[in-house]
Interface confidence: medium
């Protein structure tokens, strides 16, 4: 017969003859013969194969590596690469999430309007008026101004959107 | 001048607890979030936890997670970090860092010199 120009999914052509692919999970060890199978083993401990292949060598999992603030998302398996995520308060550098950054911080007069998520960083918005911000946080929002009035109490010194008011007693003497 | 200066560490055995202690001046320390970080012998700075100036709001690895406790006194001028169920992979010199302002990857604008604890039988 003649040796076939194609092969079926799932097997490949060598020697003039269709050798059946190593499924995922599983590498290459002998290609198959006229008298046996395509030999295939499976991957090591941390190692995968996502695909029906006819490789020799399984990929290394990703390495979640907390020294870039990394940490496992999804564990990988024989089939699957391993997921890396952000920890918390930090989020991905690239969709690929290769390296995170620490959420940047509001400066004083500005308050977190979001707070960051694993993919995005912090959202900051001026403080309006009547409120303020006296911290450098990738956290805090902006505070309201104390209200003298409730504590009966006159403002001494205004606030602004770094400072809040002073409160002070109020004048007793009537002219 | 920004100084911190850790204090707490120590040697302990598995399961052992120790608080960690971290003292801040040359900068007005309630308005800044804080944060503990680690390098244990041979390896990089690993993050292990942040709190926010207010102290509202506090993060942690997934490896300290349900362990640690982050906390501030402000009025004190003090970070504390009390460590309970100790590992031998909690071994490490763990340094207090103030947060940077900007974008960093691992680069802690300040850090004290650190203190080192020790988690061995």
């Known amino acids: 017969p003649e040796p076939p120009t194609a092969c079926r999914e799932k097997q490949y052509l060598i020697n003039s003859q269709c050798c059946s692919l190593c499924q995922p999970g599983q590498k290459l060890v002998s290609d198959c013969t006229e008298f046996t199978e395509t030999e295939c083993l499976p991957c090591g401990e941390s190692e995968f194969l996502d695909t029906w292949n006819r490789e020799t060598h399984c990929h290394q999992h990703k390495y979640c590596d907390p020294n870039l603030g990394l940490r496992v998302q999804q564990k990988g398996t024989s089939e699957t690469d391993t997921i890396c995520t952000c920890e918390e308060g930090w989020h991905c550098t690239s969709e690929a999430c290769e390296s995170c950054v620490l959420h940047r911080s509001c400066s004083p007069g500005f308050g977190v309007k979001q707070i960051a998520t694993g993919v995005s960083d912090t959202i900051c918005e001026p403080c309006p008026v009547g409120f303020f911000s006296n911290v450098s946080s990738a956290f805090e929002k902006c505070h309201p101004w104390t209200s003298c009035e409730t504590k009966d109490l006159v403002v001494q010194q205004a606030g602004t959107n770094k400072t809040d008011v002073v409160c002070g007693p109020q004048d007793r003497l009537r002219a | 001048e920004v100084q911190l200066l850790e204090s707490g560490g120590g040697l302990v055995q598995p399961g052992g607890s120790l608080r960690l202690s971290c003292s801040a001046s040359?900068?007005?320390?309630?308005?800044?979030?804080m944060q503990w970080v680690r390098q244990a012998p041979g390896k990089g700075l690993e993050w292990v936890s942040t709190?926010?100036?207010?102290?509202?709001?506090?993060y942690y690895a997934d490896s300290v997670k349900g362990r640690f406790t982050i906390s501030r006194d402000n009025s004190k001028n003090t970070l504390y970090l009390q460590m309970n169920s100790l590992r031998a992979e909690d071994t490490a010199v763990y340094y207090c860092?103030?947060?940077?302002?900007?974008?960093?990857?691992?680069?802690?604008?300040?850090r004290g010199r650190g203190t080192l604890v020790t988690v061995s039988s």
């Open positions: 040359g900068f007005t320390f309630s308005g800044y979030d």
């Open positions: 709190i926010s100036a207010s102290g509202v709001y506090t």
């Open positions: 860092a103030k947060y940077p302002n900007r974008f960093a990857l691992n680069s802690f604008d300040y």
